[in-house]
Structures are given as structure tokens and as C-alpha cells.
Interface confidence: medium
């Protein structure tokens, strides 16, 4: 039973895969990531999103072998470098192969940082927010929801991503206007519910 | 933890060249902004050059080695390299390689949270 759901969740990211693309699956992948790791570093999540999106999209296209042999790889990293990811994982990692990325898969969320800065201050108040944003506009997007989504456990993915959603769309807008930073400086008001 | 190991320096003449690597031993390289700086002996350390995360197609270099210096990364290799043209004497400096994941790019020692222990430069006239 703990199989068939565990299946029929794989179907569901597969039917996601398909319908929303690359791009929306590593939007939820960093998204829960971060909420699963929030001591993990932006570089950290980012790496293992990559990795994730390679295993789902070959497991997603039937190609079963590079899906177990991918799958095997990323639980192995994960707890060669669980002191950079999560305290929770040591009892998955000492796991038998099969159930080790199972066991990953559902681990619960790390304890958040103690005292994170504000979000403003990179995200709103900052100089280079257009700058940054011009650079690598996914990645920035990706740091802000990574940010964020690693300070509300208690949010669901589909808020977080409605969230990124509404910051993007402001800078899209900001970032072409006479005073950009007078443009985007409420943006996190719009994000109270 | 990031562990990062430069290699490449050496003694060279004013007006040659040397290549400084900067190899860091993690897979997540790629999330990572790089930089070089430099001290030289009884002075502050001081800003060479950066380069931003992931495509690194963004780099800023400090005035005193703009259009001598070049950095460059190899994100398959976990590398950042920081060709050197040109040098003068008062390039002469232990170079020392930095990353960050806090921002897409810094010039910024503060905002570099990993470093390497360093590779002597030493350029004679």
C-alpha cells in the first residue's frame, strides 16, 4: 500500500512533467527542497533540483535503468553530503539501497536556521534586484523562491509558487520602468494574505 | 563544505603571464559566484576579479587589472581559472580563490562564505 501510493505519486509528477514542463517541476522541486532542507545552500538545492529533474524525466519516459541507476547516484550524493543538507537524513541513509531513496523521499523537514535576515533586504531593497534579475532571471526567481519557501514550512508548494509567480511578473514590470525600485518596493505587501 | 585548492603560481618576469586554477570539491559548484583576490605583504586584501554562478557570463575586474586579467570557470571541472597578461611587479601578491552562493556576482570580500588557503605570485622587474 506504501508501494501503490508511492506509485501513483510517481504518475502524478509524470502527468506534471508532461503537462507543465521542465521548467514548472523544478519550480516545485526547489520550492519543497528548500522547505525539506533549509540549511541546505542555494547551490546545494539547485544541484539536487538538476539531479531530480534528470531521474523523474527518465523514470517519466520508461527508460527504467538510468531511472534506478540515476535514482541510486542522487541518494548516494545526498548522504555522502548529508551534513550540508539535512540533520534528518542519517537514519534514511543507513537504509539498504532499495529503500534508501524512499525513505529520502519522505524524510521529514530539517529545522529552519536560526535568525535568517529579512527577505527584503536581497529580494526588495537591494540596488542589483534589476541587475540580478537581467543576469539569470530563472536563477534569481529560483533564490527568491528558495528563500522563501526555506522560511514557510507551513506554506503549500502551490501558494510558494503563486508567490514567485506574482514577484516575477512584478519585476517583469518594475524592471522596465522609470524608477524601478519606487515600482517594486511594495511588492511583499501584495504577498499578505 | 566547499573545500577550494588554487594552483599556478609561481615566479615570473614583468610582463609575463601565469594561469591561476581554482579547483572546489563540490558537485554543487555550478550554484556558486567565484572570485579572486590578493594580499600583499603588510597590506589589506584587496579585490581581483569575480564571476557570477551557473553560465558565469557575467565578470567585473578591479581597476588595476582591467584588460590585463581574464577569469574564466569550467563548470564540468569545478574550476575557476584567472589568466594573468601583462604583470607587473606590483601584481606581486598571494592570490586567493573565494565562492559564494549568497548573490549571482560579489566584489565584496564579506560576501564570500568559502576560501582557499592560497597561491603565491611573485613578478620581478
Known amino acids: 500500500d506504501e508501494g501503490k501510493a508511492s506509485s501513483a505519486k510517481q504518475r502524478l509528477k509524470c502527468a506534471s512533467l508532461q503537462k507543465f514542463g521542465e521548467r514548472a517541476f523544478k519550480a516545485w522541486a526547489v520550492a519543497r527542497l528548500s522547505q525539506r532542507f533549509p540549511k541546505a545552500e542555494f547551490a546545494e538545492v539547485s544541484k539536487l533540483v538538476t539531479d531530480l529533474t534528470k531521474v523523474h524525466t527518465e523514470c517519466c519516459h520508461g527508460d527504467l535503468l538510468e531511472c534506478a541507476d540515476d535514482r541510486a547516484d542522487l541518494a548516494k550524493y545526498i548522504c555522502e553530503n548529508q551534513d550540508s543538507i539535512s540533520s534528518k537524513l542519517k537514519e534514511c541513509c543507513e537504509k539498504p539501497l532499495l529503500e534508501k531513496s524512499h525513505c529520502i523521499a519522505e524524510v521529514e523537514n530539517d529545522e529552519m536556521p536560526a535568525d535568517l535576515p529579512s527577505l527584503a533586504a536581497d529580494f526588495v531593497e537591494s540596488k542589483d534586484v534589476c541587475k540580478n534579475y537581467a543576469e539569470a532571471k530563472d536563477v534569481f526567481l529560483g533564490m527568491f523562491l528558495y528563500e522563501y519557501a526555506r522560511r514557510h514550512p507551513d506554506y503549500s508548494v502551490v501558494l510558494l509558487l503563486r508567490l514567485a509567480k506574482t514577484y516575477e511578473t512584478t519585476l517583469e514590470k518594475c524592471c522596465a520602468a522609470a524608477d524601478p525600485h519606487e515600482c517594486y518596493a511594495k511588492v511583499f505587501d501584495e504577498f499578505k494574505p | 563544505e566547499v573545500q577550494l585548492v588554487e594552483s599556478g603560481g609561481g615566479l615570473v618576469q614583468a610582463g609575463g603571464s601565469l594561469r591561476l586554477s581554482c579547483t572546489a570539491s563540490?558537485?554543487?559548484?555550478?550554484?556558486?559566484?567565484m572570485g579572486w583576490f590578493r594580499q600583499a605583504p603588510g597590506k589589506e586584501r584587496e579585490f581581483v576579479a569575480a564571476i557570477s554562478w551557473f553560465a558565469g557570463d557575467t565578470t567585473d575586474y578591479a581597476d588595476s587589472v582591467k584588460g590585463r586579467f581574464t577569469i574564466s570557470r569550467d563548470n564540468a571541472k569545478n574550476t575557476v581559472y584567472l589568466q594573468m597578461n601583462g604583470l607587473k611587479p606590483e601584481d606581486t601578491a598571494v592570490y586567493v580563490c573565494?565562492?559564494?552562493?549568497?548573490?549571482?556576482?560579489?566584489?565584496?570580500?564579506?560576501?564570500?562564505?568559502?576560501w582557499g588557503q592560497g597561491t603565491q605570485v611573485t613578478v620581478s622587474s
Open positions: 573565494a565562492a559564494s552562493s549568497a548573490r549571482p556576482m560579489s566584489g565584496r570580500s564579506d560576501e564570500y562564505h568559502y
Open positions: 563540490r558537485r554543487a559548484f555550478i550554484g556558486y559566484a
